[in-house]
């Protein structure tokens, strides 16, 4: 696994312990909580990051209206079960044997049940809508400059292929970033949109996951872009299955 050889650290994940005990004395980094070896040349999966976090000593408008099937992560943090590749297991359960099904970004997509609950497959989240509100500025940002800056950010900081950034919408003070990635589009080695969105979310909150790098300093033509609110909507390839009680609540 690639890691900075000079001092054996993981540039893309500070929630690791790295030691020169890999093959041939190479640096090997293991995610806190799970102990899984991670590839430090790319983003770590959201599942392993959440597990590490839990183990640590915590209409005519251009804007998109989220679909009726869009999920928002209202359940907050939990200690997830990850598969050997670091992906979320389709079924998650807590200490009291309450279980639920999740999508590929770990967001609950069914009502909660007991241990008999079946989650046949991990349903892929293929469309992520990141909804941001920026702090007041002297004037609106130039849309094309903003678009270019956010695309550059996802390409350079999160290593997300540009084709997966479907659109950047802007209506002051709301910015929306649309990420799309179908199962068929994702090739081996491609960063997952769910992982990129999670790194971005943590960056926006001032909780960068990168090792030793400064926090996110977003600027558009030199003007700081300061985010004061973030909402992320997740759309799955198969719509979620909630009871009518929840849908009408």
């Amino acid at each position: 696994h690639t890691a900075a050889q000079d001092n054996c650290t993981c540039p893309t994940n500070k929630m690791t312990v790295c030691s020169p005990d890999g093959p041939g004395g190479r640096c090997q980094c293991r995610a806190l909580g799970s102990g899984m070896a991670v590839d430090c040349s790319t983003l770590t999966s959201k599942c392993l990051l959440l597990k590490a976090r839990m183990s640590a000593p915590k209409n005519a408008r251009t804007l998109v209206r989220p679909s009726e099937h869009a999920l928002v992560d209202n359940d907050g943090l939990y200690d997830p079960d990850c598969d050997p590749e670091g992906r979320f297991k389709a079924r998650q359960c807590n200490q009291t044997s309450v279980c639920w099904c999740v999508n590929s970004v770990g967001v609950r997509r069914t009502d909660k049940g007991d241990l008999s609950l079946r989650c046949d497959e991990l349903v892929r989240t293929h469309h992520i809508l990141i909804d941001l509100r920026h702090r007041p500025t002297a004037g609106a940002f130039n849309h094309s400059d903003l678009d270019a800056e956010l695309r550059r950010l996802f390409r350079e900081r999160y290593r997300l292929h540009p084709k997966f950034v479907a659109a950047v919408h802007y209506e002051q003070p709301t910015i929306q970033i649309e990420l799309r990635q179908n199962t068929s589009q994702k090739a081996a080695g491609d960063v997952d949109i769910g992982d990129a969105a999670y790194y971005f979310e943590r960056d926006i909150k001032g909780e960068s996951l990168f090792q030793g790098r400064g926090g996110l300093d977003l600027r558009v033509r030199g003007e700081p872009l300061q985010v004061e609110r973030t909402l992320i909507y997740y759309l799955d390839e198969i719509p979620p299955k909630f009871s009518m009680k929840r849908l009408t609540a």
């Epitope: 030691s19 005990d21 806190l32 899984m36």
Partner: antibody, heavy 117, light 107 residues
Framework: EVQLVQSGAEVKKPGASVKVSCKAS????????INWVRQAPGQGLEWMGN????????NYNQKFKDRVTMTRDTSTSTVYMELSSLRSEDTAVYYC??????????WGQGTLVTVSS | EIVLTQSPATLSLSPGERATLSCRAS??????IAWYQQKPGQAPRLLIE???ESISGIPARFSGSGSGTDFTLTISSLEPEDFAVYYC?????????FGGGTKVEIK
């Protein structure tokens, strides 16, 4: 030559605690994980947890989480494993082991801990 | 946690025979498996890492194979000193776990 030398055998009463030491030499102490593995008489091997001496990060097997504490002293290149609230089923040989690649390459000689009233 | 199941529990063979020991993981662990030999009163000795990579100083008659969930340790021709207990161990994720062991005894 890499060496892991453990403290001597201990006899303890139920409810007591035991602290086993493991002194490392022949390599950079802070660079490699030290794991603790135990083996009850006639039984198999059981991983208890590990410590990374560089920053004292510890990870414990859930089975022992509330009773085990692993610490290190970099000045003496020594790792300690303390197990509290001892019971008869804790009678075992306790090994420290240094981890390399995918295996436990170096082992201490083992420390027999006997729990008896 | 990842459960490792070793079979058979006991293998009765004669010197010169070939020994085939199996280790099955409860989930895919790639090649994150190691094999150990343990003799009475001694600490375990690492034989194989990464499922198939031999450790320097270990005789060439010991070899490992497999990936995913099924792994095998083969001793091509048993020597008298090879009669011992053999354990597999996974290091894919914490908690690290060992198989229950296979005892290779003289027939």
């Amino acid at each position: 030559e890499v060496q892991l030398v453990q403290s001597g055998a201990e006899v303890k009463k139920p409810g007591a605690s035991v602290k086993v030491s493991c002194k490392a030499s022949g390599y950079t102490f802070t660079s490699y994980w030290i794991n603790w593995v135990r083996q009850a008489p006639g039984q198999g091997l059981e991983w208890m947890g590990n410590i990374y001496p560089s920053n004292s990060y510890t990870n414990y097997n859930q089975k022992f989480k509330d009773r085990v504490t692993m610490t290190r002293d970099t000045s003496t290149s020594t790792v300690y494993m303390e197990l509290s609230s001892l019971r008869s089923e804790d009678t075992a040989v306790y090994y420290c082991s240094s981890y390399r690649s995918e295996g436990f390459a170096y082992w201490g000689q083992g420390t027999l801990v006997t729990v008896s009233s | 946690e990842i459960v490792l199941t070793q079979s058979p529990a006991t293998l009765s063979l004669s010197p010169g025979e070939r020994a085939t020991l199996s280790c099955r993981a409860s989930q895919n662990i790639g090649t994150s498996i190691a094999w150990y030999q343990q003799k009475p009163g001694q600490a375990p000795r690492l034989l194989i890492e990464f499922a198939s990579e031999s450790i320097s100083g270990i005789p060439a008659r010991f070899s490992g194979s497999g990936s995913g969930t099924d792994f095998t340790l083969t001793i091509s021709s048993l020597e008298p000193e090879d009669f011992a207990v053999y354990y597999c161990q996974q290091s894919n994720s914490w908690p690290f776990t060992f198989g229950g062991g296979t005892k290779v005894e003289i027939k």
